[in-house]
């Protein structure tokens, strides 16, 4: 009798732990649908918010033909405002002609007045030369004014209408330019 | 989390040339920039190369007209092709991914482990 009530005893307790493993499972079920759910909301709201701003800029951009224009806020030097264009999917402004530069320093005019941007223009320290940073050149008419005295590394900046250099550790605004996303209908 | 997966380094003579890949792998909701960075010992990280998913390139001076940085958009793949290498050009090279996390809605920066890239005769 009392190997009988023993066993069945040991029985309910083997059931009592299947069922507490059970519970845990759910729960950890739970929790992952969970996490799921938010996976799931935060893509359909990234997706959602892609979706629906189709324009051909992101929002506080500025549209010119096939660019996209991001005037920056905040002061940086120039690697570093490079790479706050990169986060953005972007590079710093290349000004391809006197259009695009006339557009450029009409809508700072607009926005902010006779400030400093980083352009995505640098020195060669070893030719001097003027470079663009996908490695072409400038045009004749889009070279900085006035060579910068600097020993260090000397970059390009648009101040009122006109292209100047300075040193590239110097704090100013910048401006990032990326390409318009072209409509599919 | 995305995780970065390097190759291509190795021993070079000057001259000579490399291909170094990297792809991204992992949860995010996009990549807006892949790019290059080289780091020698004591000194920061400085870029090399980077390319935009929207394709827009950026070189550091002194890679100019010599390494060359391209991008595979699906399969999340970014491609620097080193020609006319210098000895000066030797350090770790570190590929980077700048992502949108599923939960963010501004991109972070992402490292590979690095790959050592040596220029010597």
């Known amino acids: 009798k009392l190997l009988q009530v023993s066993t069945i005893a040991m029985q309910q307790q083997e059931k009592l732990i299947q069922q507490e493993r059970a519970l845990l499972n759910f729960t950890e079920w739970k929790r992952s649908c969970a996490l799921q759910m938010k996976y799931c909301q935060a893509f359909m709201q990234n997706s959602l918010s892609s979706a629906h701003n189709s324009s051909p800029c992101p929002n506080n951009w500025i549209q010119n033909r096939e660019s996209c224009y991001y005037v920056s806020e905040i002061w940086s030097i120039w690697h570093t405002s490079q790479e706050n264009c990169l986060k953005e999917g972007s590079t710093l402004l290349q000004i391809e002609s006197k259009e695009e530069m006339d557009f450029i320093t009409g809508s700072l005019r607009k926005i902010k007045g006779s400030y400093d941007y980083w352009v995505g223009l640098s020195q060669d320290g070893h030719s001097g030369r003027w470079l663009w940073q996908d490695g072409s050149s400038p045009s004749p008419g889009l070279l900085p004014a006035e060579r910068s005295q600097s020993a260090n590394q000397v970059c390009g900046y648009v101040k009122s209408n006109s292209l100047l250099s300075s040193n590239c550790s110097t704090w100013k605004y910048f401006i990032c330019e990326k390409y318009a996303l072209r409509s599919s209908v | 989390q995305v995780q970065l997966q390097e190759s291509g380094g190795g021993l070079v003579q000057p001259g000579g040339s490399l291909r170094l890949s990297c792809t991204a792998s992992?949860?995010?909701?996009?990549?807006?920039?892949m790019g290059w960075y080289r780091q020698a010992p004591g000194n920061q990280r400085e870029l090399v190369a980077a390319i935009t998913n929207g394709g827009r390139i950026a070189y550091t001076d002194s890679v100019k007209g010599r390494f060359t940085i391209s991008n595979d958009n699906a399969k999340n793949t970014v491609y620097l092709q080193m020609n006319s290498l210098k000895p000066e050009d030797t350090d770790v090279y570190y590929c980077n991914a700048k992502a949108i996390p599923i939960y963010g809605s501004t991109a972070e920066d992402y490292w590979g482990q690095g790959t050592q890239v040596t220029v010597s005769s």
């Open positions: 992992g949860s995010f909701f996009s990549i807006n920039a």
